[in-house]
Interface confidence: low
């Protein structure tokens, strides 16, 4: 038998052996597709089927429009001029090449030590669903499940039968100070089929460490305000994406949704103590920031109460 | 064969402080960071925090901040947590790990520690 | 701070399969989380089992794996042996805060 590959949506030919080229002719072409149950026989009269399949006057076969529910075995029987039978046995397979795969959400850096996600690699309108491929610095990268991480995800459309793929890549570089270039290639796994690439992305690799310059600022200044009077606590960070930051009260985290700004209205004895804030980076974990002390007292002379401003409660996880 | 071995059990005078011992064997020390966990009698496990013995860099949380203070020697493969003012609450069984982030696959057979005047 | 659920014990025979579970009271749970299990023997004899939601460490059988199912972690064993009664223990990494669930006891009848 031979194989044949056609691209969905485009006509495919099958040729009968043997066959005389035009009738007299004496010849079966019979398939088992996924349009049939079992075997179909086909009518060089035509019929019903002439829209999927018709049998042309030099009795090749022809597909106007293969599908995926054409995949399958295709046979024809001939008779041809000398009264021998010849018999043709096609199985054929379809494809349809996706569009160009991308890599969404990319990374904008990558942090040394730590993992990080670099991005999803997507291929949409594939059939069959085919593969994913990443590689840095041009080289195939083979997930290893520890420094490289590997989560991916094919689902197939419920009308197209055509498939959408995502792989996304988690990476622990080992050393800060290079630039890796990442990219990600789409194979159908068909011969004389070249890959499909995306665009490369070059990624910055940094040392680990803390956020820069985290600050809590208070007012008013000098944490010390009057009963009933309000105390606003910012949490000035200078790092991009801005990180989530929570609020910590005498070392216990407050119950609060994540906020830069902690406001503390009509202010009474129950308020007094040390706050800080812990900015949470997603490449560097958490950072606190150096404490400031809230007193609530009717006198304002009794001096500055600020904490003292020391080094940061948590350091990075490197 | 890769081990994490740590020191017996300690019993210490509340208001003390004690440092216990993980010692690392079978693999590269600086590879992998150490994780250290708290199991209290009957209770489940809590995480203090992690320590990369390559930088130094330690990873605290929260709750142990202040309580605890992770320390390596490279030198010798061994980390170390140091445990300071201690109550009956710090009673408690210790635990080292080997963590790559992916997963915590080594563990040391823990130390007891006992808070008791 | 997260809370991480477990079912508190489960039984089952030899040779069936089982499936424990991890919930997160942030909401679902993602391969951000980077799950973990970890296996409590007797005489506290710990072992890393999963990582990083479905990667076993070396040395473990292939019995074990772990997945995302719905909105948790779960670790299911296939064809589950004696010697697996044990605690289970998952963790997850919130921003690099890691919470551990209050363990799973398996009894294998």
């Known amino acids: 038998g031979q194989n044949i590959t056609a691209r969905i949506g485009e006509p495919l030919v099958l040729s009968c052996k043997g066959a005389p080229k035009k009738p007299p002719q004496q010849l079966e072409w019979k398939l088992n597709t996924g349009r049939t149950e079992a075997w179909k026989v086909l009518s060089p009269q035509g019929g019903p089927w002439d829209s999927v399949a018709r049998i042309l006057p030099n009795g090749s076969l022809l597909l106007p429009a293969t599908g995926i529910v054409d995949e399958g075995t295709f046979r024809c029987r001939a008779t041809n001029r000398r009264g021998k039978e010849v018999k043709s046995n096609y199985r054929v397979r379809v494809y349809q090449i996706p569009g160009k795969p991308e890599i969404v959400d990319p990374a904008s850096e990558l942090t040394a030590s730590v993992p990080n996600k670099v991005g999803t690699c997507v291929s949409e309108g594939s059939y069959p669903a085919g593969t994913l491929s990443w590689h840095l610095d041009g080289k195939l990268l083979i997930p290893d499940g520890k420094e490289t991480l590997v989560k991916e995800e094919t689902r197939r459309h419920p009308e197209t039968g055509l498939f959408t793929l995502r792989s996304e890549l988690t990476v622990i570089p080992t050393q800060g100070g290079t630039h890796p270039t990442f990219s990600c290639s789409f194979s159908l796994g068909l011969p004389r089929r070249r890959p499909l690439n995306t665009a490369p992305i070059q990624l910055r690799v940094r040392e680990p460490g803390p956020p820069e310059g985290i600050q809590l600022l208070v007012e008013p200044e000098g944490g010390i305000v009057a009963p009933g009077g309000t105390v606003t606590l910012t949490c000035a960070i200078s790092a991009q994406p801005p990180p989530q930051v929570h609020w910590i009260k005498d070392g216990a985290p407050l119950p609060l949704a994540p906020s830069p700004v902690l406001l503390l209205p009509e202010v009474g004895h129950e308020d007094e103590g040390t706050y800080s804030c812990v900015a949470t980076h997603p490449s560097h974990g958490p950072q606190e920031s150096p404490p400031v002390s809230i007193r609530v007292t009717e006198t304002g002379d009794e001096g500055p109460a600020e904490g003292s401003v020391g080094e940061s409660g948590l350091g990075t996880l490197a | 064969e890769i081990q994490l071995q740590q020191t017996g059990p300690e019993l210490v005078k509340p208001g003390a402080s004690v440092k216990i011992s993980c010692k690392a064997s079978?693999?590269?020390?600086?590879?992998?960071?150490m994780l250290w966990v708290k199991q209290s009698h009957g209770k489940s496990l809590e995480w203090i925090g992690n320590i990369n013995p390559y930088y130094g860099s330690t990873f605290y949380n929260l709750k142990f901040k202040g309580k605890a203070t992770l320390t390596v020697d490279k030198s010798s493969s061994t980390a170390y947590m140091q445990l300071n003012s201690l109550t009956s609450e710090d009673s408690a069984v210790y635990y080292c790990?080997?963590?790559?982030?992916?997963?915590?696959?080594?563990w040391g057979a823990g130390t007891t520690v006992t808070v008791s005047s | 701070q997260a809370v991480v659920t477990q079912e508190s014990a489960l039984t089952t025979s030899p040779g069936e399969t089982v499936t424990l579970t991890c919930r997160s009271s942030?909401?679902?749970?993602?391969?951000?989380?980077?799950a973990n299990w970890v296996q409590e023997k007797p005489d506290h004899l710990f072992t890393g089992l999963i990582g990083?939601?479905?990667n076993r460490s070396p040395g473990v059988p292939a019995r074990f794996s772990g997945s995302l199912i719905g909105d948790k972690a779960a670790l299911t064993i296939t064809g589950a042996q004696t010697e697996d009664e044990a605690i289970y223990f998952c963790?997850?990494?919130?921003?690099?805060?890691?919470?551990f669930g209050g363990g799973t006891k398996l009894t294998v009848l």
């Open positions: 990083g939601t479905n």
């Open positions: 079978g693999y590269s020390f600086t590879d992998y960071i």
């Open positions: 790990a080997r963590s790559d982030y992916w997963y915590f696959d080594v």
């Open positions: 963790a997850l990494w919130y921003s690099n805060h890691l919470v």
């Open positions: 942030t909401g679902a749970v993602t391969t951000s989380n980077y």
